[in-house]
């Protein structure tokens, strides 16, 4: 259905990391433009990215209102220069996105090791608590603020002189590990939400090694 000079969007895909959420689709427009609508299962449709020639739309501002809700989006196609024109059934062509629940599906961004400090034979490693675009009372919440104990971190650490990795886990953003005196260690962390069925783990953080600027040493 629809007019001969418009085609429906297809391959609607959610791209979301730490709640920064963009809907992407195809095809690149030829003589047509797009408008996106988003709603929760029980809510009204809200229009975004009006009459755009882009094939993506940033929906972050909408989904951060309640990240535990399930959202549905749809992309309307209109003839360029004639946005009032509709399909043969009197409606513009549109395609629905898959459902998307940010809390359960947003990808965990690559974490960063904020600092590490050695005191004798122990090293305290701190993971940066990254800010998200989720707000409460006008303040941006951190990843920990949003996920709480659903979020854990795994630390991988090894002696610089060997390849044998050890692991530790934490329900906070801090680790305190035992190390051999006089040895340098390298560290990498990964964010994990064990209760998830998809997108459970982030990519590993950049490796940080003792003897570099980020660390601090105390006897």
């Amino acid at each position: 259905s629809g007019t001969t000079n418009t085609v429906a969007a297809y391959n609607l895909t959610w791209k979301s990391t730490n709640f920064k959420t963009i809907l992407e689709w195809e095809p690149k427009p030829v003589n047509q433009v797009y408008t996106v609508q988003i709603s929760t299962k029980s809510g009204d449709w809200k229009s975004k990215c009006f009459y755009t020639t882009d094939t993506e739309c940033d929906l972050t501002d909408e989904i951060v209102k309640d990240v535990k809700q399930t959202y549905l989006a749809r992309v309307f196609s209109y003839p360029a220069g004639n946005v009032e024109s509709t399909g043969s059934a009197g409606e513009p062509l549109y395609e629905n996105s898959p459902e998307f629940t940010p809390y359960l599906e947003t990808n965990l961004g690559q974490p960063t090791i904020q600092s590490f400090e050695q005191v004798g034979t122990k090293v305290n490693v701190t993971v940066e608590d990254e800010r998200t675009l989720v707000r409460k009372n006008g303040t941006f919440l951190s990843l920990r603020d949003v996920f709480g104990k659903d979020l854990i971190y795994t630390l991988y650490y090894w002696k610089s002189s060997s390849s044998g990795k050890k692991t530790a886990k934490t329900n906070t953003n801090e680790f305190l590990i035992d190390v051999d005196k006089g040895e340098n260690y390298c560290f990498s962390v990964q964010a994990v939400i064990p209760s998830r069925t998809v997108n459970r783990k982030s990519t590993d953080s950049p490796v940080e090694c003792m003897g570099q600027e980020k660390g601090e040493f105390r006897e």
Epitope: G148, L155, F175
Partner: antibody, heavy 125, light 108 residues
Framework: QVQLQESGPGLVKPSQTLSLTCTVS?????????WSWIRQHPGKGLEWIGE???????RYNPSLKSRVTISVDTSKNQFSLKLSSVTAADTAVYYC??????????????????WGKGTTVTVSS | EIVLTQSPGTLSLSPGERATLSCRAS???????LAWYQQKPGQAPRLLIY???TRQTGIPDRFSGSGSGTDFTLTISRLEPEDFAVYYC?????????FGGGTKVEIK
């Protein structure tokens, strides 16, 4: 030293909403701990109801989730429990507790280390 | 839901004796999330052991915890009069957090 005190009506009618508040003294509710509600039916064991972080992030027992709301008021240093559509089966001693991080095995994990004295709630007409 | 089964339900012992309390999980529990609590009549529970084996500050060394996977044990090496109470194991790794049904340690 952190202390917790539960408050709220001791008698609630069936089908109504049970509302309890836990006041935190001797420490800030925003200091990186979680805050929990647990109940104990007469002569029985303990049942975890749910927990909240100062940011408002919550986790609930699935068996009660449809009826439970836990909220936090950082300005008053309090957190609250609401349990709707109560029946006689909700008669219990209700405890609030602090969930604080403890070091174990290279990381930090949360345990309920400070509890209120508990308040008895009876559901009866 | 992880079900924790405690045994025995009641343990009748005399002061000075050794108490061994068992907690068995319906599926594997990460030791990091296993705790033991003591509760006396009319009082709130008190944290004794966390991480399956680490004593909370101020808890006497006659209390010890051990175990991993699905089998955990709380041992009281020599019972003191104040130790007669109900003991609960708890897992806080998987929602819903669950408690065992409790073991009552009573004076014989």
């Amino acid at each position: 030293q952190v202390q917790l005190q539960e408050s709220g009506p001791g008698l609630v009618k069936p089908s109504q909403t049970l509302s309890l508040t836990c006041t935190v003294s001797g420490g800030s509710i925003s200091s990186g701990q979680y805050w929990s509600w647990i109940r104990q039916h007469p002569g029985k064991g303990l049942e975890w109801i749910g927990e909240i972080y100062y940011s408002g992030s919550t986790r609930y027992n699935p068996s009660l989730k449809s009826r439970v709301t836990i909220s936090v008021d950082t300005s008053k240093n309090q957190f609250s429990l609401k349990l709707s559509s109560v029946t006689a089966a909700d008669t219990a001693v209700y405890y609030c507790a602090r969930d604080a991080p403890y070091y174990y095995g290279g990381g930090y994990y949360y345990y309920m280390d400070v509890w209120g004295k508990g308040t008895t709630v009876t559901v009866s007409s | 839901e992880i079900v924790l089964t405690q045994s025995p339900g009641t343990l009748s012992l005399s002061p000075g004796e050794r108490a061994t309390l068992s907690c068995r999980a319906s599926e594997s529990v990460d030791s990091s999330y296993l705790a033991w609590y003591q509760q006396k009549p009319g009082q709130a529970p008190r944290l004794l052991i966390y991480g399956a084996s680490t004593r909370q500050t101020g808890i006497p060394d006659r209390f010890s915890g051990s175990g991993s996977g699905t089998d955990f044990t709380l041992t009281i090496s020599r019972l003191e009069p104040e130790d007669f109470a109900v003991y609960y194991c708890q897992q806080a790794g998987v929602v819903p957090y669950t408690f065992g049904g409790g073991t009552k340690v009573e004076i014989k």
